[in-house]
C-alpha cells in the first residue's frame, strides 16, 4: 500500500547559490513544470565554468497514499523527493570524457529539501471507525547545498530530519514503507 502505485515526474531545478549568477527568468518561472528536458539547461546554452545552468538538482514528484496502521488517506498526496548530486555537469561521474572527476576533498553540492509544507489529510479506516485527521510534512522544494568532507555522513543521507526521528538501520515492520525510506533509496541510487 502507499507506494504500490505512484506517479513520478522529474524536474531539474536551478540551485540558489550566491556565488553563481541567477538563472534565466524563463527557467525560474517554469521550474515546477519543467520535465528534465535538456538536463535542466536551456537549449543551445553554451558551457561555461561558472554557468549556473550546469548545476542541477532534480525534484521528483511522487503521488502516493499515506497510511497509519490500517487507515489510508482518502486522496493521494503529492510530494517531492530531492534527487541526485548537484555539481557542474562536466565534473560529475556520469560525464567521463568531458572533464575531470570530483576531487573527494573538494566541496560537494547535494540536492536536499529546501522548504516543507504541512498538508492536512483525512485517513479512512476499516471497520466503521471514524476517519482520522493527520498533518503530514511534505517537501515543497529542493536546493543544492554546498557541503565539505567534514560534514557528518548522517547529514548527507538525511537532510531536514529532526532530532526525534528513528535511528537509521532500525526499520519499521515491512507492513508499510515511509516516504523517508523511499527518499533514501532514491538518493542512494545516484
Amino acid at each position: 500500500q502507499g507506494w504500490q502505485a505512484f506517479k513520478n515526474d522529474a524536474t531539474e531545478i536551478i540551485p540558489e547559490l550566491g556565488e553563481y549568477p541567477e538563472p534565466p527568468p524563463e527557467l525560474e518561472n517554469n521550474k515546477t513544470m519543467n520535465r528534465a528536458e535538456n538536463g535542466g539547461r536551456p537549449p543551445h546554452h553554451p558551457f561555461e565554468t561558472k554557468d549556473v545552468s550546469e548545476y542541477s538538482c532534480r525534484e521528483l514528484h511522487f503521488t502516493r497514499y499515506v497510511t497509519d496502521g490500517p487507515c489510508r488517506s482518502a486522496k493521494p498526496v503529492t510530494e517531492l523527493v530531492c534527487s541526485g548530486q548537484c555539481g557542474p555537469a562536466r565534473l560529475l561521474p556520469n560525464a567521463i570524457g568531458r572533464g575531470k572527476w570530483w576531487r573527494p576533498s573538494g566541496p560537494d553540492f547535494r540536492c536536499i529539501p529546501d522548504r516543507y509544507r504541512a498538508q492536512r489529510v483525512q485517513l479512512l479506516c476499516p471497520g466503521g471507525e471514524a476517519p482520522r485527521a493527520r498533518k503530514v510534512r511534505l517537501v515543497a522544494s529542493c536546493k543544492c547545498k554546498r557541503l565539505t568532507r567534514f560534514h557528518n555522513q548522517s547529514e548527507l543521507k538525511d537532510f531536514g530530519t529532526e532530532a526525534a526521528r528513528p535511528q537509521k538501520g532500525r526499520k519499521p515492520r515491512p507492513r508499510a514503507r515511509s516516504a523517508k525510506a523511499n527518499q533514501a533509496e532514491l538518493e542512494n541510487a545516484y
Epitope: 499515506v66 490500517p70 493527520r134 515492520r173 516516504a179
Partner: antibody
C-alpha cells in the same frame, strides 16, 4: 531547535479555573497538532486531547470535554489548556506535546517540560 | 477504548542483566510507542513504531511485537536505564497509555 516551553506551576482554589500555556519555538504550530496529557502524582499518563492550531478544531478523550478547553494564538506560536471547575482530582502535571506524522506513523517526539497544577484550599 | 496492560509493574535488576517488559493490548493494534520517564522529567520518546529507536537511544534497547503483544528489551541494563517505561497506542481512539513499568537497579 524544536522546543515546547510551558508556563510555571500554579496553585488554585477548588472550583476555580486555570490556564496553562505551551509556547513553541523552532517550528510553526500551525503545521502540527498539539496534544495535552495529564499525569497525576506518581501515576501514569492520560491523554486529554488535541487541537489543530491552524483552524482551532479540537478532539477530546471521552472524560475531558466538559473539563478542558484548548485554544491557540498562532501569532505568539502558543497553545493553551484551560481547566475549569477544578477539584483535587485535577491536581496533576499537564504536558503539551507535538504530534508528528510521516505518512506511515504518528508519534510524539517533542514534549513540554510539564506544568504542575495543584488544587488546594 | 483499548486498554494497555504493562507487566511487570516493577522490575529490580542488576547492571548487565537482560530485561524484557511487555505491553498487552485489549484488542489488536498496528504498532506501539514506548516512552522513558525519569523522576522530575517529562516523558521522552524512546522506541517509535514498535521497533525503531528514537535519536540518542542506546543500541542495547530493542522493541518488538505485533497484534496484541509488544515488548521492550534491554540487552544489558545500565544504571542510566533506571526509569519508568510507558507504552502508548493510537490505533484506535482515544489515544491510550499503559500504566508503566518501573525499572530499578539493585
Amino acid at each position: 531547535e524544536v522546543q515546547l516551553q510551558q508556563s510555571g506551576a500554579d496553585l488554585v482554589q477548588p472550583g476555580a479555573s486555570v490556564k496553562v500555556s505551551c509556547t513553541a519555538s523552532g517550528f510553526d504550530i500551525k503545521d502540527y497538532y498539539i496534544h495535552w496529557m495529564k499525569q497525576r502524582p506518581d501515576q501514569g499518563l492520560e491523554w486529554i486531547g488535541r487541537v489543530d492550531p491552524d483552524n482551532g478544531e479540537t478532539e477530546f478523550a471521552p472524560k475531558f470535554p466538559g473539563k478542558a478547553t484548548f485554544t491557540t494564538d498562532t501569532s505568539s506560536n502558543t497553545a493553551y489548556l484551560q481547566l475549569r471547575g477544578l477539584t483535587s482530582e485535577d491536581t496533576a502535571i499537564y504536558y503539551c506535546g507535538r504530534e508528528d506524522y510521516d505518512g506511515t506513523y504518528t508519534w510524539f517526539p517533542y514534549w513540554g517540560q510539564g506544568t504542575l497544577v495543584t488544587v488546594s484550599a | 477504548q483499548i486498554v494497555l496492560s504493562q507487566s511487570p509493574a516493577f522490575l529490580s535488576v542488576s547492571p548487565g542483566d537482560k530485561v524484557t517488559m511487555t505491553c498487552r493490548a485489549s484488542s489488536s493494534i498496528s504498532y506501539i510507542h514506548w516512552f522513558q520517564q525519569k523522576p522530575g522529567s517529562s516523558p521522552r520518546s524512546w522506541i517509535y513504531a514498535t521497533s525503531n529507536l528514537a535519536s540518542g537511544v542506546p543500541g542495547r534497547f530493542s522493541g518488538s511485537g505485533s497484534g496484541t503483544s509488544y515488548s521492550l528489551t534491554i540487552s544489558r541494563v545500565e544504571a542510566e536505564d533506571a526509569a519508568t517505561y510507558y507504552c502508548q497506542q493510537w490505533s484506535s481512539d482515544p489515544l491510550t497509555f499503559g500504566a508503566g513499568t518501573k525499572l530499578e537497579l539493585k
